[in-house]
Interface confidence: low
């Protein structure tokens, strides 16, 4: 009679993480008489992960009867495939021997592949904020999927990016990989309602790709531009002041108004307008009793933003010569007039102007008596 | 015994090539990967690629990126590692070694061509 | 890409010593590291694989020890054959590494 064979047909199995593998083998006789083995790896560090004579193997199915007469299929299948379970099987017939079995044939080997699906791509972005014209950098990491094929590509606001890196680790074979990705992107001032979106398409997805995305409003910074200008009065004593500071993000800011270089307020935005492009305006304003100053004033609108250093812009107060004639020496506290919001600005303004008004004529006149 | 016999010592002008051959013997040539790393005198070791002998995979590393080319003939159990543009600092000793397929050791390697980049 | 930072970059022992070289990765890499041993002259040789095990031939007085970031290789009662610049390399992603190198010189 010929001398038994042991067949495993396929070569090789791919299974999607969770399901069952089965791995197919059959015996072309009957003799000699002794017990299968299943075992993943070849040599001296092989694993059993079946044995027909002994054992308990949960996982472990055999696909036909293997006590029933006459049975050549050694077939098992295995379930709940993981990523560790990917490798080389090899259906092993045993010869019946005393005291033990000997190892009589091999079957050329299965080798079991693993489909796992990568996690949900986490992009995150730069520790710091960075200004428009700067390049920041995001990564974006994904775990755990097999085979190693992998796509991933960037995207700025739909538009696909070119400038980056990836690595697909281990550089060796491994159960399961992970993928990293470093993507460089040129901030503009309109970035504030941008987005960047890491994609990730695998063979587990069925053309259904991974998205992780990150806000660029998390990594810029545009710094405000100022602008001073003296607004008419009614008062002839009175000079009302502005600092429109427009332009910036994010939210965080405090303005301090100088004269002629010493502080006279300081103040924390508060009532914001929001810009179409998500950056935000800004405005205060300092009241000046101009009676009480004999000379010229300089006035500085000084802005820090998001805990940068102060930029600032500063306006000279023109005191007219008729002014300078009434001035005294007496210390000067301007009369300011709180930043408040439009509503109350319009409803109020125009008396309280009045009011600072007249006690500001009042107080020159009372100084020059 | 397995062994990696490389081509001998070259001396090369700047801006010129150079290819290095690295003949595979007493292993399955196709089983392992083939890594190149070359030593700056008085210098440490720096990876510079490696190819998958079995499927001709190649990675090669950034800084290389574009100046090298890692080849393989199957049949003559050779990799090749050609290096263009050359500048001074290219001189150094050019090592291949056998790699693990798995944790990409470094097991067998050659004993090493110098290159020598000079005007 | 990962760096790797070996320490000390050398040292001097006498015959009999235990020494100790650490490596160090800018981020996990499991056990994906290798050691290496050249002498000058000569191309490396590789000591230990996969952190911890000896390849074949070498002897029982070198071992490694690490996983994840922090690596060592211990020469257990130095040798003579054994002054020479030893290298740590990780292998867990490209581009691969090495470390500056250990150059251990006679006391």
């Known amino acids: 009679e010929d001398e038994l064979q042991v067949i495993q047909p396929e070569k090789s199995v791919s299974v999607a993480a969770g399901e069952s593998a089965t791995l197919r083998c059959a015996m072309t006789s009957l003799i000699p008489v002794g017990p299968i083995m299943w075992f993943r790896g070849a040599g001296a560090g092989r694993e059993l992960i079946y044995n027909q004579k002994e054992g308990h193997f949960p996982r472990v199915t055999t696909v036909s009867e293997l006590t029933k007469r006459n049975n050549l299929d050694f077939s098992i299948s295995i379930s709940n495939i993981t990523p560790a379970d990917a490798g080389t099987y090899y259906c092993v017939k045993f010869r019946k021997g005393s005291p033990d079995d000997v190892e009589f044939k091999s079957g050329a080997g299965t080798e079991l592949s693993v489909r796992a699906k990568p996690s949900a791509p986490v992009v995150s972005g730069p520790a710091v904020r960075a200004t428009p014209e700067h390049t920041v950098s995001f990564t974006c990491e994904s775990h755990g999927f097999s085979p190693r094929d992998i796509t991933l590509k960037w995207f700025k606001n739909g538009n696909e990016l070119s400038d980056f890196q990836t690595n697909v680790d281990p550089a060796g074979d491994s159960v399961s990989y992970s993928i990293h990705s470093t993507a460089r992107v040129v901030l503009t001032r309109g970035d504030v309602h941008s987005q960047v979106i890491c994609e990730i398409a695998h063979i587990t997805l069925q053309g259904d790709p991974l998205r992780g995305t990150a806000n660029l409003s998390e990594a810029i910074r545009v710094p405000p531009t100022l602008e001073v200008t003296q607004q008419p009065m009614r008062a002839e004593n009175q000079a009302n002041v502005t600092c429109q500071v427009s332009n910036f993000y994010p939210r965080g800011l405090q303005l301090t108004w100088l004269e002629n270089g010493n502080v006279s307020r300081t103040e924390t935005a508060s009532t914001l307008i929001e810009n179409k492009d998500g950056t935000y305006n800004w405005m205060s304003w300092l009241l000046v009793n101009t009676c009480a100053h004999r000379d010229d004033v300089v006035l500085t609108c000084q802005v820090e933003h998001d805990g940068q250093q102060a930029v600032s812009k500063s306006y000279a107060l023109e005191i007219s010569a008729h002014q300078k004639e009434h001035g005294s020496d007496i210390t000067h506290e301007a009369a300011l007039a709180p930043t408040a919001p439009l509503l109350v600005a319009l409803l109020l303004g125009p008396k309280l102007l009045l009011v600072v008004g007249v006690s500001a004529i009042y107080i020159c006149w009372k100084q020059k008596a | 015994q397995v062994q990696l016999v490389q081509s001998g010592a070259e001396v090369k002008k700047p801006g010129a090539s150079v290819k290095v051959s690295c003949k595979a013997s007493?292993?399955?040539?196709?089983?392992?990967?083939m890594h190149w790393v070359r030593q700056v005198p008085g210098q440490g070791l720096e990876w510079m690629g490696w190819i998958k002998a079995g499927n001709a995979e190649i990675k090669y590393s950034q800084k290389f990126q574009g100046r090298v080319t890692i080849t393989r003939d199957t049949s003559a159990t050779t990799a090749y590692m050609e290096l263009s543009s050359l500048r001074s600092e290219d001189t150094a000793v050019y090592y291949c070694?056998?790699?693990?397929?798995?944790?990409?050791?470094?097991?067998?390697w050659g004993k090493g061509t110098t290159v020598t980049v000079s005007s | 890409d990962i760096q790797v930072t070996q320490s000390p970059s050398s040292l001097s022992a006498s015959v009999g010593d235990r020494v100790t070289i650490t490596c160090r990765a800018s981020q996990s890499i499991s056990d994906f590291l290798n050691w290496y041993q050249q002498k000058p002259g000569k191309a490396p040789k590789l000591l230990i694989h996969a952190a911890s095990s000896l390849q074949a031939g070498v002897p029982s007085r070198f071992s490694g020890s690490g996983s994840g970031t922090d690596f060592s290789l211990t020469i257990n009662s130095l040798q003579p054959e054994d002054f020479a610049t030893y290298y740590c390399q990780q292998s867990y992603s490209t581009p691969l590494s090495f470390g500056g190198g250990t150059k251990v010189e006679i006391k």
């Open positions: 070694a056998r790699g693990d397929y798995y944790y990409y050791y470094m097991d067998v």
């Open positions: 007493g292993y399955t040539f196709t089983s392992n990967a």
